[in-house]
């Protein structure tokens, strides 16, 4: 049995229904069987877990996803073995295997792989700060969202009116969410906002930086 699946990965927003397309061509016999299984990201195919079987004319959803899986066509004997997965969770991200068996059609292995990414908006990020906050010192502002798929990019902005910082005194890394401030001055004090963004939305946090004279302690 030759199985056909999309070549490009599938992306589905959190809470929506994913349709994992799988089709095949074979003269369906009574021994026809379909199995859908799931592998977590980074794990080998050998560690797949079954989520649905069809055999002997009956459908058997199984495992932790069993209440959320069904077939687009039941029975899946018309050449369409497409899986529907409702209310997708972040833990549904991974590789799905569509395997069709139909003895004596052994021309190919009857296996198709589909990568699913569940799209999750960034969670409210956590803003933190470390380093010397006295005049002339350096500090790092960090921003991180615990959730978000694809991984959010981070952008720091300083709120309010302020003099333009000298070039090189503000360097940010959109991937790590870190903003490094060097050669601090009293005018570096103020509120800084980090915005975490992906295709599903954005979320932000704020942090107030107080730069002090060298003799004073730091206040965050």
């Amino acid at each position: 049995v030759e199985v056909k699946v999309p070549t490009e990965p599938l992306s589905t927003p959190l809470g929506k229904t994913a349709e994992l397309t799988c089709t095949y061509s074979t003269s369906v016999g009574d021994s026809f069987a379909l199995e859908w299984s799931f592998v977590q990201p980074g794990k080998p195919i050998s560690e797949s877990h079954p989520i649905l079987y069809f055999t002997n004319g009956h459908l058997y959803p199984t495992g932790s996803k069993s209440k959320r899986v069904s077939l687009l066509q039941n029975p899946p004997t018309v050449g369409v073995a497409t899986l529907k997965l409702t209310d997708v969770h972040p833990s549904d991200t991974g590789t799905y295997l569509c395997q069709v068996n139909n003895p004596p059609d052994f021309y190919t292995n009857g296996l198709g792989l589909i990568n699913l990414t569940v799209l999750v908006p960034p969670s409210n990020p956590l803003c933190s700060q470390s380093g010397q906050t006295s005049v002339g010192g350096s500090t790092a502002l960090r921003c991180s969202s615990s959730e978000g798929a694809p991984k959010p990019v981070y952008n720091w902005v300083r709120l309010g009116t302020f003099p333009t910082p000298s070039p090189g005194s503000m360097v940010q890394d959109e991937v790590s969410g870190q903003l490094i401030l060097t050669n601090l001055s009293l005018t570096s004090s103020g509120t800084y906002r980090c915005v975490a963004t992906n295709q599903m939305g954005s979320a932000s946090c704020e942090l107030t930086l107080s730069v002090t004279e060298p003799s004073q302690g730091r206040v965050a």
Epitope: T23, S25, T26, S27, V28, G29, D30, N56, T77, G79
Partner: antibody, heavy 118, light 107 residues
């Protein structure tokens, strides 16, 4: 030598019923998917039903669904098509055909003519 | 449903001619296509399956090609026995459908 011989065709009034038969020989019938394909006079071919090797799975196009029933008796090497609620547009030569491992038709019978007319 | 469209509907040719018949599918059917030959008053005969595979006994002057939505049946040198009607059929997802046929007649 593979042989498929259809029978049971004839003249029937609209709304009537007819049962076609196909006798198979020369191959292992119980291992083969089978289909019926029809051809209206002077027209092209239309697949009308299929059945899996043991009869568990049957399929039909929308044009005949709910009116036609395909069945088989592997002990008798026979394929059947029960046609109910016949319409004028069902008038055609009905061929019994064996399916390959993929669903193309590698052997065909000689056909039996069904005429639906008042 | 997948629609199959053949062209031309009729083709006039002479013995020895190279003849090409085209079949288009309304959506991607990969290589799941069969060709049949039918002579008047006879049942169809399988010529090609999986777009390009010839069953045993089919003369090598017949060849099939194509994938996706565009397919061709070629007769490299038309013989007297080849004057007939030719049909394409997809063997992908049900319902399996046929083209309307191409009649190859003597010029």
């Amino acid at each position: 030598e593979v042989q498929l011989v259809e029978s049971g065709g004839g003249l029937v009034k609209p709304g009537g019923s007819l049962r076609l038969s196909c006798a198979a020989s020369g191959f292992t019938f119980s291992n083969s998917g089978m289909s019926w394909v029809r051809q209206a006079p002077g027209k092209g071919l239309e697949w009308v039903s299929s059945i899996s090797d043991g009869g568990l799975y049957t399929h039909y196009p929308d044009s005949v669904k709910g009116r036609f029933t395909i069945s088989r008796d592997n002990a008798k090497n026979s394929l059947y098509l029960q046609m109910n609620s016949l319409r004028a547009e069902d008038t055609a030569v009905y061929y019994c055909a064996r399916q390959g491992v993929r669903p193309f038709f590698d052997y065909w019978g000689q056909g039996t003519l069904v005429t639906v007319s008042s | 449903d997948i629609q199959m469209t053949q062209s031309p509907s009729t083709l006039s040719a002479s013995v020895g001619d190279r003849v090409t018949i085209t079949c288009r599918a309304s959506e991607n059917i990969y290589s799941y296509l069969a060709w049949y030959q039918q002579k008047p008053g006879k049942s169809p005969k399988l010529l090609v399956f999986n777009a390009e595979t010839l069953p045993e006994g089919v003369p090598s002057r017949f060849s099939g090609s194509g994938s996706g939505t565009e397919f061709t049946l070629t007769i490299s040198s038309l013989q007297p026995d080849d004057f007939a009607t030719y049909y394409c059929q997809h063997h992908y997802v049900i319902p399996w459908t046929f083209g309307q046929g191409t009649k190859v007649e003597i010029k």
